[in-house]
């Protein structure tokens, strides 16, 4: 299923990444889909 609004799929974690948590670390590969 696609990720919910405000989140993005992370191939590194095999789960949806909450983009709000990426604001503090935009340079993490986990956050690539939130850029």
């Amino acid at each position: 299923a696609p990720c919910s609004r405000g989140s993005s799929w992370s191939a590194d974690l095999d789960k949806c990444m909450d983009c709000a948590s990426c604001a503090a670390r935009p340079h993490s590969d986990f956050c690539l889909g939130c850029a």
Partner: antibody
Framework: EVQLLESGGGLVQPGGSLRLSCAAS????????MIWVRQAPGKGLEWVSY????????HYADSVKGRFTISRDNSKNTLYLQMNSLRAEDTAVYYC?????????????WGQGTLVTVSS | DIQMTQSPSSLSASVGDRVTITCRAS??????LNWYQQKPGKAPKLLIY???SLQSGVPSRFSGSGSGTDFTLTISSLQPEDFATYYC??????????FGQGTKVEIK
Amino acid sequence: EVQLLESGGGLVQPGGSLRLSCAASGFTFSPYPMIWVRQAPGKGLEWVSYISPSGGSTHYADSVKGRFTISRDNSKNTLYLQMNSLRAEDTAVYYCARGGDTYFDYFDYWGQGTLVTVSS
Amino acid sequence: DIQMTQSPSSLSASVGDRVTITCRASQSISGYLNWYQQKPGKAPKLLIYQASSLQSGVPSRFSGSGSGTDFTLTISSLQPEDFATYYCQQSYTSPFITFGQGTKVEIK
């Protein structure tokens, strides 16, 4: 009880190969990212490689890229590190560790380590 | 790459002393900083995660603070079992993580 048990270390000549294993028990292995970290004799900790829970995504330190391959078999609860073209500077204790937290922010369980010695 | 620099590299202290170890990042890492303890011949053990959260089972004499580039690990009253090497580690650039060079706490 969570346990990670490394094996496969030993003495190998420069240019040789080794395959390290890390057997996991006491937890459900498949949802967790895993890493390898090494420690040269008398030195600090160096991250080596990362693998996603499914094994579909991998990352490597520049020092081992193109020579080492990380993989996992979730059906066997085992993590691997294939080490090729070994160099003297690869001599170290190799640890596997489990990524903790929702977003892999720390490593909450470590194996006891296996020693790799590269020497002629 | 983000470099992590610990100070001091080693220190001598007595049982009961308050000990402070500093970790400085070469750029801001927000609060993505963890601390580990390692005893000779043993694997590292997680003490503090996300700068200030105490890992389950770790004694409350250990505490962490800081944000941005400067972080501190404090042992409020050093115990005999605390003599070890301590490492900081940043996860800001996960999965590409880096460790500090370590701080060895020795008996005075």
